[in-house]
């Protein structure tokens, strides 16, 4: 296995996932494509935790670019051994991967809490509240209850879809960073095994 190529593949995947996380989080601010609910502060409290923008997004770009950089051939050797610098780089990528695990973990936790609590909406009794908070997430299994939210239109579908996407993306990011921890440790211990002749596709 070529540890550097694997890291680069993980890095590129994380960039894509991070951008999707940022997009999903931004969409949470505009239920049904409307801006007024953000300005009126009629959005779920978990939208304001920036889990997709920060946790699954910006914080994920740091490890992503570190992983991508591992494939470069300009790693400095040490004590006359070229592979020593690459080993150090692989081991340092473990630290970057741990930052990624923290970011994606934050994204997953906040998305799960957002799903469990449900949206802030104008209920059928004309009150703005966390209508489904008392259901402990069971509203997710009973779509006939979603009409209890009268405003914003389709807010339950909107929240459930986007928080589910954040949960899934964060979960994938978490797994990829976990893989890179293992990859980085193995790459650091076993050495940078790729010769210039070897070509591996991820």
């Amino acid at each position: 296995m070529c540890y550097g190529k694997c890291a680069r593949c993980i890095g590129h995947s994380l960039v894509g996932l991070a951008l999707l996380c940022i997009a999903a989080n931004i969409l949470l601010y505009f239920p049904n494509g409307e801006t007024k609910y953000a300005s009126e502060n009629h959005l779920s409290r978990f939208v304001w935790f920036f889990s997709g923008i920060v946790g699954g997004g910006l914080l994920m770009l740091l490890p992503a670019f570190v992983f991508i950089g591992l494939e470069q051939d300009d790693c400095c050797g040490c004590c006359g051994h070229e592979n020593c610098g690459k080993r150090c780089a692989m081991l340092s990528s473990v630290l970057a991967a741990l930052i990624g695990i923290a970011g994606s973990g934050y994204c997953v936790i906040v998305a799960a809490l957002g799903l469990a609590e449900g949206p802030l909406c104008l209920d059928s009794l004309g009150q703005w509240n966390y209508t489904f908070a008392s259901t402990e997430g069971q509203y997710l299994l009973d779509t006939s209850t979603w009409s209890e939210c009268t405003e914003p239109k389709h807010i339950v579908e909107w929240n459930v879809s986007l928080f589910s996407i954040l949960l899934a993306l964060g979960g994938i990011e978490f797994i990829l960073c976990l893989i890179q921890v293992i990859n980085g440790v193995l790459g650091g211990i076993c050495g940078f095994c790729c010769s210039h002749q070897q070509q591996y596709d991820c």
Epitope: L122, S124, L125, G126, S144, T145, S147, T150, P152, K153
Partner: antibody, heavy 116, light 107 residues
Framework: EVQVQQSGPELVKPGASVKMSCKAS????????MHWVKQKPGQGLEWIGY????????NYNEKFKGKASLTSDKSSNTVYMELSSLTSEDSAVYYC?????????WGQGTLVTVSA | DIQMTQSPASLSASVGETVTITCRTS??????LAWYHQKQGRSPRLLVS???TLAAGVPSRFSGSGSGTQFSLKINSLQPEDFGIYYC?????????FGGGTKLEIK
Amino acid sequence: EVQVQQSGPELVKPGASVKMSCKASGYTFTSYVMHWVKQKPGQGLEWIGYINPNNDNINYNEKFKGKASLTSDKSSNTVYMELSSLTSEDSAVYYCAGYGNSGANWGQGTLVTVSA
Amino acid sequence: DIQMTQSPASLSASVGETVTITCRTSKNIFNFLAWYHQKQGRSPRLLVSHTKTLAAGVPSRFSGSGSGTQFSLKINSLQPEDFGIYYCQHHYGTPWTFGGGTKLEIK
């Protein structure tokens, strides 16, 4: 003071349609959800549907789909319910109720009598 | 649709007494239950929403309790204006459904 005023009684022939109104006053109309409820003489309450005048979000009881049609006019703070293809089964008092920050405010009801 | 079963269908009580009306639902509605009072020839009036939240202007002698599928409305120290029909109603999604009513009469 919050008030919900409904239109007067209606005597209509079978097969005809009727449109009743419900005018709200004393509060921000668009911050309320307006519900319609049917009550046959001497019987219980039956929910027809709701309309949120702020975004025209409408939800009907499956039983009244095709029978009732809810609309709103923000300029006059009025919601309307039209009942079509009337039969004797539709003879009842129809209540309009506004639900919002000041609680629930029910109209006095509109009596609809379907008779040949 | 969620079925609402009220009991008793009717009861007689004297002014000053305490009465309890119960409501059972066909599925778990958590705390999404409301109570109404209707006098003869009048519109229903909301008393309680979300099981125990008293509506504006409702006297403290009224209290709601319960959760899941079993709910009750308790009226302490009955007053002459409390007589009439009481309805329970779920507001856990749509369609809203009402109980058959409990007729409270003066003994």
